[in-house]
Interface confidence: medium
């Protein structure tokens, strides 16, 4: 008599997450009498997947009617596949008894599940940095299978090369995660710049997933300061201007000091944006020269985005201003810091 064969024709089956998987199994003989059971994995820790006689297997259905006479097809269909269903499935023939005795197993069919990566999430540095400094951006995507995946970084459309990428775990798994770090050198023009993390995977039909981050959230552009004096007015008042230019973000406080004493404090708000995304702000201070005996030292002090204050000083020479109307001013700029250095 010919020995019973349990035939699983497919070595492997690959399906997309959410689809159904058909696992084929036929037997070569109806003898001996006894049930067929499906297991995932082999050995003592194997998991029962389907048993016609007993149990509740809501996602598993037989492909053909196993109750009909002379049925030799014990193929099953598993619906709504998830990555957790990956593994090797065995069709096993038992001899009827008390208890039933395992007689023969099929060679096994490896089910691999193709799962899409999650939308890449890009995170930037916790604190802002200034131009010429390097900041790191991280991109993460999870839950994909198979392991092969491509991740690229772009800044304003140009691919970045200072990148380190890891796919975990290193060994075999039902699904994988990717984490990549890109290092970007900031420039003063980067307020409107964007970094993109692009993930390509076979499940995406050639349409990569993208995650983005705006460099505006990572950059601080410190201001340039310039203090100038306008011509003296007829009423012996000098108009001194503090121009604060090319700064980002907008958060800025300006304080005028006259001979070291606070004269006025202003907060920048609702400023128009320059083309490059930075801001400018101009503040005026009127100094009544006739009220001073000595030269007046004016200081424009700017605190930008919580950073240490930057000062720009200017001396108005009272001695150079006779008390008659309409005379011209002579002023000396004694300031040094034209911009903040970090």
């Amino acid at each position: 008599e010919e020995e019973l064969q349990v035939i699983q024709p497919e070595k492997s089956v690959s399906v997309a997450a959410g689809d159904s998987a058909t696992l084929n199994c036929t037997v070569s003989s109806l003898i001996p009498v006894g049930p067929i059971q499906w297991f995932r994995g082999a050995g003592p820790g194997r998991e029962l997947i389907y048993n016609l006689k007993e149990g509740h297997f809501p996602r598993v259905t037989p492909v053909s009617d196993p109750t009909k006479r002379n049925n030799m097809d014990f193929s099953i269909r598993i619906s709504n596949i998830t990555p957790a269903d990956a593994g090797t499935y065995y069709c096993v023939k038992f001899r009827k008894g008390s208890p039933d005795v395992e007689l023969k197993s099929g060679a096994g069919t490896e089910l691999s599940v193709r799962a899409k990566p999650s939308a890449p999430v890009v995170s930037g540095p916790a604190v802002r940095a200034t131009a010429e400094h390097t900041v790191s951006f991280t991109c993460e995507s999870h839950g994909f299978s198979p392991r092969d995946i491509t991740l690229k970084w772009f800044k304003n459309g140009n691919e970045l090369s200072d990148v380190q990428t890891n796919v975990d775990p290193a060994g075999k798994s039902v699904s994988y995660s990717i984490r990549s770090t890109a290092r970007v050198v900031l420039t003063r023009r980067d307020v409107h710049s964007q970094v993109i993390c692009e993930v390509a995977h076979v499940t995406l039909q050639g349409d990569p997933l993208r995650g983005t981050a705006n460099l505006s959230e990572a950059i601080r552009v410190p201001p340039f300061l310039e203090v100038t004096q306008q011509s003296m007015r007829a009423d012996n008042q000098v108009n001194v201007t503090c121009q604060v230019t090319k700064f980002y973000p907008q958060r800025l406080q300006l304080t005028w000091l006259e001979n070291g004493n606070v004269s006025r404090t202003e907060m920048a708000s609702a400023l128009p944006e320059n083309k490059d995304g930075t801001y400018n702000w101009t503040s005026w201070l009127l100094v009544n020269v006739s009220a001073h005996r000595d030269d007046v030292k004016l200081t424009c002090q700017v605190e930008h985005d919580g950073q240490p204050a930057v000062n720009k000083s200017f001396s108005v020479k009272v001695s150079a201003h006779p008390k008659e109307q309409g005379s011209n001013t002579a002023a000396e700029n004694t300031g040094t810091n034209e911009r903040n250095i970090y």
């Epitope: 070595k11 492997s12 690959s14 997309a16 193709r114 198979p146 092969d148 491509t150 995977h201 076979v202 499940t203 995406l204 039909q205 050639g206 349409d207 990569p208």
Partner: antibody
């Protein structure tokens, strides 16, 4: 049943243009990347172009130097290949093929013959 | 551009196992090349057999299987049938383009 039916082939003079169509049925075109592959008389297969499922991304053979453009109308379940500046060496049977995922040519059309000759 | 090389012709007998291979000029074929195997029968009838190295297209007989053997992609027909006589093309993916091999003419005598 999945079916791919190419049309638009024919005889064209060197330097001329031709537009091939591939009508897809039995599946939703937008869910699949699609490709054009050609076979010159007595030769093997040469890959021409791929369009991603949405049509937003395309990949083309460098050898074609931008003369061919792949596109699709997912609402009409149709893939296209616009061929410009045709040369004698473009004479071939052009096949459209469906990609299961992005790495798996599963179904092929019956082909459309393009002959470039004066 | 990479060159993909296949045996030009192979002959087997019904019931025998035959293996066709596919070599890349750039080095070892890996899973990232997503090896495909396509069958051409007379009258330009093409059928995708294997994709992504080892995934068999639904409806393709179980005797066809794909794998990597050494540094090459391989198509194995276990128990060849007379109807398997055809030309078999492999295709490999290189980052942004596919390259087909020249094809293997399989004769089943």
């Amino acid at each position: 049943e999945v079916q791919l039916l190419e049309s638009g082939g024919g005889l064209v003079q060197p330097g001329g243009s031709l537009r091939l169509s591939c009508a897809a049925s039995g599946f939703t075109l937008s869910s699949y990347a699609m490709s054009w592959v050609r076979q010159a008389p007595g030769k093997g297969l040469e890959w021409v172009s791929i369009s991603s499922g949405s049509g937003a991304n395309t990949y083309n053979a460098d050898s074609l130097k931008g003369r061919f453009t792949i596109s699709r109308d997912n609402s009409k379940n149709t893939l296209f290949l616009q061929m410009n500046s045709l040369r004698a060496e473009d004479t071939a049977v052009y096949y459209c093929a469906r990609l299961r995922f992005f790495d798996w040519f599963d179904y092929w059309g019956q082909g459309a013959l393009v002959t470039v000759s004066s | 551009q990479a060159v993909v090389t296949q045996e030009s012709a192979l002959t087997t007998s019904p019931g025998e196992t035959v293996t066709l291979t596919c070599r890349s000029s750039t080095g070892a074929v890996t899973t990232s090349n997503y090896a495909n195997w396509v069958q051409e029968k007379p009258d330009h009838l093409f059928t995708g057999l294997i994709g992504g190295t080892n995934n068999r297209t639904p409806g393709v007989p179980a005797r066809f299987s794909g794998s990597l053997i050494g540094d090459k992609a391989a198509l194995t027909i276990t128990g060849a049938q007379t109807e398997d006589e055809a030309i078999y093309f492999c295709a490999l993916w290189y980052s942004n383009h596919w390259v087909f091999g020249g094809g293997t003419k399989l004769t089943v005598l």
